[in-house]
């Protein structure tokens, strides 16, 4: 009975040709969306001239179809039981799940004006940026149409900077035919207790972004779990997204299509300043817009995007200190909506629906030689837009997976 | 102790091209940018131009555009002034000064420009 | 191009007295204004950066004020050691621009 089934299950969640497990992990049979919502700035010259609170609007949901493309280059390594791959990116637009097109037009902070200072803090070399953001007619907010703003668009700023730099800009540039990786992943074979557990990352088993265990990289990629998950645990897991590991706790059971699954949530904590969680403090890597790391909820990720002040949260600033959202109007955080789950099967370990909910933030920062942000009288961080990636197991998966494992069980 | 050496005095004929250098020491090369600064005999002081040396980019002034080349070797922490097409009007004292979040805060000694036939 | 107008040319003062030096520009640069320090032989020393801030290590009888367009340089109490030639340096707009520069004399 109990026996059989462990053993059957042990068998088909290692990542092997021929397991389940490994047909679902290379190309996942879930449809998954990533949807979007565009902070749209409604003061732009209020705010660049008087340094007003910002007000935004939010817009959206504009969907796209991820994570649709297969893993490639899958190597198995029988000396160390791991698989290497790397998961390619692609992004398809659906506009009957969409409120417009991708040629809406939104006023958003201008990305490159915002991040010049900040990447090039020398005085000589802001006073050549000023004159050339002057000249290129640029200023603190622009106005971009949803596929640039995502995908990339030629900076009429940085295209005239006299030595080489890239000058496209997008909140994901590049992502169409870019991958993700090399990771490298326990396969199970020896160890079920490790499988989908990432062993490296780009070819390093740490991050290079965080000083001391904040940049470990542990757990698996959230796709899936080793089997039999308890309530107690704890979820480790790697989001290359916001360049860091981080972890779920058990907040409920449901019932998804018939099958049992624990819902796991990211808790609050997770966001919390070194003051309210010691074990953050790594998190906090600069000292002036973190108030002295006492801010919390919003994710410096600079280290990982060449130095551009990105800001990592959660949506609407949910869970994130009331200094942070202060300048910004406009904002309504709601735990349902805003928050990061994972519905996992318990007996495999598999995640059969999850949300994933993240906003990217750009940071602005007065700076005296640069005239489109010398009238700003405090630092921003700057909603850009939110994103909600959502996956669940199809019906006739659902069916199958109750056949396979949960029926059999019962 | 921050410091910036520059080459010594030069006797070119008009026509000529001579390349003036400014080895930095003591402190981070790319940290600060690099300017060079023009004196004429009994006269002000002209800006030509600076120099970013993490990425060797630069700006002139318009009339110094194609008479400097400024150029950089991070690997020796030096600054490098080329002028070309001499004529009188190029004799001057030439320096190199650093610049960080203060507008030149350290001048090299000068180099000294002599072009005469 | 952003204009320096400094004046006077040349200035001749008692030991003691207060000397004033002024920059006008032609266009607003805030208070990104400098002033040097030269001496014969020697190449320009900053006195005072932009924001009217005294560099470390110069005596507190050099001040400056202004905004705008309008700056000026003041000796408190001048000594002998203070005879030397003086620049106002605009650094707010390219290309950066100096004064023509005011020689001190002692009278």
């Known amino acids: 009975g109990d026996m059989l089934i462990e053993k059957t299950i042990k068998r088909e969640v290692v990542l092997e040709e021929g397991t389940t497990a490994f047909k679902n992990w290379v190309k996942t049979g879930t449809t998954v969306y990533r949807q979007f919502w565009i902070f749209d700035v409604q003061n732009p010259d209020d705010v660049a001239k008087n340094s007003s609170k910002i007000k935004v609007k939010q817009r959206g949901p504009y969907t796209y179809r991820v994570r649709y493309l297969a893993k490639e280059n899958i190597t198995q390594d029988p000396e160390d039981h791991t698989v290497s791959f790397v998961q390619p990116n692609g992004a398809i637009f659906e506009p009957s799940l969409s409120v417009g097109t991708e040629d809406d037009n939104f006023t958003v902070l201008n990305l490159a004006v915002a991040a010049a200072p900040h990447i090039y803090q020398n005085s000589f070399v802001q006073v050549v940026l000023n004159s050339l953001i002057k000249k290129s007619k640029s200023s603190m907010f622009q106005t971009r149409s949803l596929k640039e703003l995502l995908w990339g668009y030629k900076d009429p700023f940085l295209s005239l900077v006299p030595y080489p730099i890239s000058t496209t800009v997008g909140v994901f540039y590049p992502y169409n035919d870019t991958v993700d990786g090399v990771y490298k992943v326990f396969n199970g074979k020896d160890n079920i207790s490790k499988v989908a557990i990432i062993e490296s990352y780009k070819g390093k088993r740490n991050l290079s972004y965080w000083p001391s265990y904040c940049d470990m990289i542990n757990g698996t990629d959230a796709a899936s779990f080793p089997p039999f998950v308890e309530k107690s645990r704890t979820l480790r897991f790697f989001s290359s997204d916001i360049c860091r590991s981080i972890y779920a706790v058990f907040g409920s059971e449901i019932d998804l299509k018939g099958i049992p699954v624990y819902r796991f949530v990211l808790p609050a904590n997770a966001f919390a300043s070194p003051l309210q969680n010691p074990d953050n403090h790594c998190f906090c890597t600069e000292k002036v817009i973190s108030n002295n790391c006492t801010s919390y909820g919003v994710l410096d990720i600079g280290k990982c995007k060449e130095g551009k002040p990105v800001y990592i949260s959660l949506p609407h600033f949910l869970h994130a200190s009331p200094d942070v959202s202060e300048p910004i109007e406009g904002l309504h955080p709601n735990e349902d909506e805003h928050r990061t789950y994972l519905d996992v099967e318990p007996i495999t370990g598999f995640t059969l629906q999850f949300a994933k909910r993240l906003q990217v933030n750009i940071l602005v920062k007065p700076a005296r030689k640069i005239e489109a942000l010398k009238n700003l009288k405090r630092p921003y961080i700057v909603p850009i837009l939110w994103l909600n990636e959502t996956g669940t197991i199809g019906d006739e998966k659902a069916e199958m997976f109750k056949t396979q494992v949960t029926g059999k069980i019962k | 102790e921050v410091q910036l050496q520059q080459s010594g005095p030069e006797l070119v004929k008009p026509g000529a091209s001579v390349k003036i250098s400014c080895k930095t020491s003591?402190?981070?090369?790319?940290?600060?940018?690099i300017h060079w600064v023009k004196q004429s005999h009994g006269k002000s002081l002209e800006w030509i131009g600076g120099?970013?040396?993490?990425?060797?980019?630069?700006s002139h002034k318009q009339n110094f555009k194609d008479k400097a080349t400024l150029t950089v070797d991070k690997s020796s922490s030096t600054a490098y002034m080329e002028l070309r097409s001499l004529t009188s009007e190029d004799s001057a004292v030439y320096y190199c000064?650093?610049?960080?979040?203060?507008?030149?805060?350290?001048w090299g000694q000068g180099t000294t420009l002599t072009v005469s036939s | 191009e952003t204009t320096v107008t400094q004046s006077p040319a040349s200035l001749s003062m008692a030991i003691g007295e207060k000397v004033t030096i002024r920059c006008i520009t032609s266009?607003?640069?805030?208070?990104?204004m400098n002033w040097y320090q030269q001496k014969p032989g020697e190449p320009p020393k900053l006195l005072i950066s932009?924001?009217?801030t005294l560099r470390p290590g110069v005596p507190s009888r050099f001040s400056s004020s202004g905004y705008g367009t309008d700056f000026v340089f003041t000796i408190e109490n001048m000594l002998s050691e203070d005879v030397a030639d003086y620049y106002c340096?605009?650094?707010?707009?390219?290309?950066?621009?100096f004064g023509s520069g005011t020689k001190l004399e002692i009278k």
């Open positions: 003591g402190y981070t090369f790319t940290e600060y940018t």
């Open positions: 120099i970013i040396p993490n990425n060797g980019g630069s």
């Open positions: 340096l605009q650094s707010g707009t390219l290309p950066f621009t």
């Open positions: 266009t607003d640069i805030d208070d990104d």
């Open positions: 932009e924001g009217n």
């Open positions: 000064a650093r610049a960080g979040d203060y507008a030149f805060d350290y």
